[in-house]
Interface confidence: low
Amino acid sequence: MRWCLLLIWAQGLRQAPLASGMMTGTIETTGNISAEKGGSIILQCHLSSTTAQVTQVNWEQQDQLLAICNADLGWHISPSFKDRVAPGPGLGLTLQSLTVNDTGEYFCIYHTYPDGTYTGRIFLEVLESSVAEHGARFQIPLLGAMAATLVVICTAVIVVVALTRKKKALRIHSVEGDLRRKSAGQEEWSPSAPSPPGSCVQAEAAPAGLCGEQRGEDCAELHDYFNVLSYRSLGNCSFFTETG
């Protein structure tokens, strides 16, 4: 099962043909952000303007791995950061118990097929409590834009639902529509609740033969934080054919 499929769908991505042209995608990030010492912060990136399929998202700080969200294997949080890093919401990452040492550059690295690798940069400044209150001015409007978009969508949905109910009180809602809404990643992943199918889940002990032992070594590439230049799929088995 593709645990991250829901989140990939939420990016509005679909499988693109093998013969791809120029890389057209862009990564929007939360940009320069500031947060209070001891507090939490959500790192978010959003890949847009491409039909490429996201196969994996890495979160890195300098050359240090924080976490991986793999479309097949789910979440892997680096042991060094397990106590202070939580997966989600979505393909994002939550940093907790911030210290001044957490100040610095963070990178979201989207591995896609057939485009290749997209990298987004976020600069986090961890401030003393009194200073952090003024730090909001550094926020790039992405989160605000996302929130605004959600508000608009919710409003539109409410209006449409209201009108629909008015016109057809006994109308049966489309199952496809409900599923589509769910699979568009409207629900946040919660560590305390079971993951919805298709979301990135914590893969603490991902079995080595996850893709089926009968496929033998052809399945052996179901891993890792490669920079993907090419990717192929065979049944339920995903192949990361490097690189980077």
Epitope: P79, S80, F107, G116, T119, A206, A208, T241, E242, G244
Partner: antibody
Amino acid sequence: EIQLQQTGPELVKPGASVNISCKASGYSFTDYIMIWVKQSHGKSLEWIGNIHPYFGNSHYNLKFKGKATLTVDKSSTTAYMQLNSLTSEDSAVYYCARRGITSAHFDYWGQGTTLTVSS
Amino acid sequence: DIVLTQSPASLAVSLGQRATISCRASKSVSTSGYSYMHWYQQKPGQPPKLLIYRASNLESGVPARFSGSGSGTDFTLNIHPVEEEDAATYYCQHSGDLPWTFGGGTKLEIK
């Protein structure tokens, strides 16, 4: 200090198998892919394959598929490479190395294990 | 497979001068603004040592006299000023596609 400690030189007979180990220390073993490289005498380097210690999955250079088998033991932070059906062509120095995170560059290397296949 | 051709196969450079080593790939190893070409130094009896990763990033602990440049298919390693301890064989390696391959090596001799 980050270290990759490999087993000493091996002298084996043609047709036999050998298991080379690479003990990692000084870093989080499961965070970094381990790669293996062959260097024949006086020649360049060849990538054999790599294994992800966390997920346990490996990938091979097609040239070495069937010749090399890569495994890891997370509890002892050790990577292993088994070479089978050995011939004189397999005589070489074999290195394990740690793959960087942001790209497949190899930032720390073992000292190398010299394998001699001779009757 | 991507073939990496290094040139020259060997060169002799006077102490304090510049050494330039070229590596040409049979296919582009660059994407999304990154070039997946790396450089190593190897001395006899020792394992290779990473000098430069992703074309131009200096590995920590490596002297600043080493620098890398290039994108697409053409890459260069520069050493300036050359020092006695730089006598070694230098290899380029790509990770632009599987299998990862190395160049044939360039042997640097100090005059």
